[in-house]
Amino acid sequence: AELFLIASPSHPTEGSPVTLTCKMPFLQSSDAQFQFCFFRDTRALGPGWSSSPKLQIAAMWKEDTGSYWCEAQTMASKVLRSRRSQINVHRVPVADVSLETQPPGGQVMEGDRLVLICSVAMGTGDITFLWYKGAVGLNLQSKTQRSLTAEYEIPSVRESDAEQYYCVAENGYGPSPSGLVSITVRIPVSRPILMLRAPRAQAAVEDVLELHCEALRGSPPILYWFYHEDITLGSRSAPSGGGASFNLSLTEEHSGNYSCEANNGLGAQRSEAVTLNFTVPTGARSNHLTS
């Protein structure tokens, strides 16, 4: 009696199942009690000897490529051996690599967690994922795993993490890069500093007083509000960051406490108050202001 090994499918793709069947065309296995064993190269597969003429392999990988055969043993211990069958496991090259961010859109608050998720639409086997920072890439990390996605995490984002990023996936057919993704780090405003600028050391009534408010840190645009004794004088915007100024034509009522507030939508901060006092110097006719 002759024995044949049949693999289905005969040309499997990595990660897919394969069924090996040990066939006896001229003998019904039910006619006699047979034990079956399947081999790859020199190694027995699965449970070893079994009464089933089929062996189910859940997932085939590139390294499972090789020469397969089966043996059948009768109760009388006569062993039949099939011819060897070459099974080539086909690897699918990586394709359509993409990089996504968590949070989506690439905008992240300073101190928050950022995850760069590298995905491939196709690709089998061990895929090596690499993450790069900057258009001229600085390699951040690499991971090799049997999955279509991998993650790189920055647990606490800093201002210096604002850059372009991309990832590369590779499974033996050459590296395939994703497109670029830009990360914007949003920084809440720091406590602003208010400075009062007068045209002379002793400002007089009708002088123009400049209130300059500046938050040294914070993502633009920044909106500055100016206050006199908690009454709003007005607001100024700094579209590109930096400070902003508000001009005031002085009258005697302008004595008192001044402050400003910076707000960039990520939080507001109020400056310390600056006091402006009128003083009447001895022998002087006009009122003067000091701060």
């Epitope: 001229v136 390699n139 890069p177 994703s178």
Partner: antibody
């Protein structure tokens, strides 16, 4: 297929401004940086800078800061280069080019836009 | 700025001959990530430049194996083993390691 189509030749007066366009097709516009290169008549090539169309963020060669403004419009997959306060020194052919990261090279170039500054 | 100096300025050759173009940088163009971003481009009259070699010695797809790049640090060479009529034009080296990125002055390959 990938193409970078630049706007036509420009003849402008000294002191004026001009905007040159570079329309990309055949690929995802926001996935790659677009660079600009200057070539004066009979001379070599000078790198001006790049723009990332994903967020419109430009990076300039210090020499061209103030002279050049790079922008990009995602909706039309078009990159722009504006040149201001033009002088005869700005008369040149300007190229846009796509640069592939990781492999790191300019793989596709526009056909070039000739700018002539003359009164 | 990194100055890229190409020699010779002009290179007259006979078809079938070997041609060699040198490119020297004023400082090392090894990037902090360990790569050397040195490229060679060919520009024919009235055309935009075309990539030949990237990262010193990697031939771009479709570029004949007659073209080869070599070098390290500050000294780089482009060799054309058997010059064909289609190879004529101006060759530029380019460094993309240090901003501002810079091109060499060009070498004109012409028929002797």
């Amino acid at each position: 297929q990938v193409q970078l189509q630049q706007s036509g030749p420009e003849l402008v007066k000294p002191g004026a401004s001009v905007r040159i366009s570079c329309k990309a097709s055949g690929y995802t516009f926001t996935s790659y940086n677009i660079h600009w290169v200057k070539q004066r008549p009979g001379q070599g090539l000078e790198w001006i800078g790049w723009i990332y169309p994903g967020d419109g963020n430009p990076k300039y060669n210090e020499k061209f800061k103030g002279k050049t403004t790079l922008t990009a419009d995602k909706s039309s997959s078009t990159a722009y280069m504006q040149l201001s306060s033009l002088t005869s020194e700005d008369s040149a052919v300007y190229f846009c080019a796509r640069r592939i990261h990781y492999y790191d090279y300019f793989d596709y170039w526009g056909q070039g836009t000739t700018l002539t500054v003359s009164s | 700025d990194v100055l890229m100096t190409q020699t010779p300025l002009s290179l007259p050759v006979s078809l079938g001959d070997q041609a060699s173009i040198s490119c020297r940088s004023s400082q090392s163009i090894v990037h902090s990530n360990g790569n050397t971003y040195l490229e060679w481009y060919l520009q024919k009259p009235g055309q935009s430049p075309k990539l030949l070699i990237y990262k010193v010695s990697n031939r771009f797809s479709g570029v004949p194996d007659r073209f080869s790049g070599s070098g390290s640090g500050t000294d780089f060479t482009l060799k054309i083993s058997r010059v064909e009529a289609d190879d004529l034009g101006v060759y530029y080296c380019f460094q993309g390691s240090h901003v501002p990125w810079t091109f060499g002055g060009g070498t004109k390959l012409e028929i002797k």
